[in-house]
Amino acid sequence: IWELKKDVYVVELDWYPDAPGEMVVLTCDTPEEDGITWTLDQSSEVLGSGKTLTIQVKEFGDAGQYTCHKGGEVLSHSLLLLHKKEDGIWSTDILKDQKEPKNKTFLRCEAKNYSGRFTCWWLTTISTDLTFSVKSSRGSSDPQGVTCGAATLSAERVRGDNKEYEYSVECQEDSACPAAEESLPIEVMVDAVHKLKYENYTSSFFIRDIIKPDPPKNLQLKPLKNSRQVEVSWEYPDTWSTPHSYFSLTFCVQVQGKSKREKKDRVFTDKTSATVICRKNASISVRAQDRYYSSSWSEWASVPCS
Amino acid sequence: RNLPVATPDPGMFPCLHHSQNLLRAVSNMLQKARQTLEFYPCTSEEIDHEDITKDKTSTVEACLPLELTKNESCLNSRETSFITNGSCLASRKTSFMMALCLSSIYEDLKMYQVEFKTMNAKLLMDPKRQIFLDQNMLAVIDELMQALNFNSETVPQKSSLEEPDFYKTKIKLCILLHAFRIRAVTIDRVMSYLNAS
């Protein structure tokens, strides 16, 4: 048993049929010695008396808020949560496996630049009685500070019969140098509590590996005289690290017909302009990627040829 | 430790082309190592990230763009002195700081070159003949060093009398390639920045 936060405790349970329960001794936080009684949750039934209460925790029915009282007055609370371990593996019932980039990916993170700011998100089908708490650090043995905000519900989607909820959190490394060469990964730890179930999820990454630039901005077309060709120009996204001559991007320019089956013409360039043939009803799209470290491409920025 | 924005004559920065070749070569070599050594811990997640140049050179700090010198987190640099003559320094206006940056890059390349050559000698003794260093990568390191053209003491190639542990050597190769790729990215960024300045 360990303390998650003040008056909230996590009991770790081996979850197999013939596992013995965990013996837990609760102590009432009071100088009083006599006349103390214990109750669980909203029930007024007395579970025991005395300054300590020894319980066996084996099921979710044994978890909850234990309260000690004296003469009708509440003295203290202890909320017990359960953390299940099945076949030596901690349960992952609360979050959905996103399976990208690999199986057992519950947390996904992205950064728009090298400033040390990043966003992580996760999915669940649970809609109520759900709380998240996020901590992060650079390295684990001698951790350096990363500050995370509160996790918030960022999207709701319908997937077949199920509703899916996306939560996200923004974190910022306390003292990040965009030019630094990372040798210790960022660690992100998410505590998830659903009703009386506790689970924790972790992700470890280098900022350089989760970079995904914003799409190029100010995408414009300039027709070339007496030609089907157009000059496409764009700019670095505002959110990209500066100076751009140091943090350079490379670009992919695509000409896409109306039909998805039509052949796509693609051009790769390090410049912020390109000359392409603009077909009728086609659209031109441009996306960006770090020029020197191949992490993710940005989403496409698009304009119609017309 | 930063690079003031110098204005060398256009086309006078031959190192950019070499640094691009270097990044391409090391990236290809790392990909080949990952594929060939698929049953070894050779991915970024599996290896320990070691920097053989740590406390010996200070490339990141010495080559910091002027715009980042206001960022205190970028200024925890170490004092290191370097020789300051090199053919990439095409413009006479190029500052002492740029020279320091380029000589730091040169020292990095020299250190990695020695490590890679020593390692290759060991890998050539492996009866499995599983993986060797790409000669193109070694040649590209050499070309960039020549382009930088710093006078520097030659570092003797490490020789070992003991029987090599090929498993450990291959793990070390992965560690070195990962670290060298990260450094090659920094070198490319620096060359691009200098070229634009």
């Epitope: 949750d41 319980i55 084996k58 | -």
Partner: antibody, heavy 119, light 107 residues
Amino acid sequence: EVQLVQSGAEVKKPGESLKISCQSSGYTFTSYWIGWVRQMPGQGLEWIGIMSPVDSDIRYNPMFRGQVTMSVDKSSSTAYLQWSSLKASDTAMYYCARRRPGQGYFDFWGQGTMVTVSS
Amino acid sequence: EIVLTQSPATLSASPGERATISCRASQSVGTWVAWYQQKPGQAPRSLIYAASNLQSGIPARFSGSGSGTDFTLTISSLEPEDFAVYYCQQYNIYPYTFGQGTRLEIK
């Protein structure tokens, strides 16, 4: 006052189905798991299993798994024990009981339902 | 599963006497043992839980002791209404199991 009131005695033929009930009152139904115990004529007590009224999480005694089905209806604070095909050997008194949280023993019992299976 | 063996199977005693019933587990169950009393035609009634804790409303003449594998139920001074069948139960490991019962009869 905590009360568990069980349905009346049943006489059935082998192969028939049956569902007996246990209605709870005097406490918060969802805060306590409900269990079932069998007592064959002239014999001792046998633990069938327990069930959470919150999410229908069940722990069966392996000896009874596949033989009986436990269920609950939260809206009526009622627990059920059912058989899809009775056998003569199912003849027994069946007790429902409330599981004490933080312990696991049964602190309150129903009066029992006698099930007789005979051709 | 854990086997609980009660002894004696039948205990003959007189009102006012002290009665002791033993329960032995085939493996350690900590202190997670309960005792029940059952009278003819009635449902069992909880007496003791966690080896030695008296269920609320149960007279103080009933007491329990033991831990690990050996447990005892003691009735300090028998009353006429105490003559019944007594069962021990372990609730440490699934499936929870009961002893075979001890019949306490009037001598």
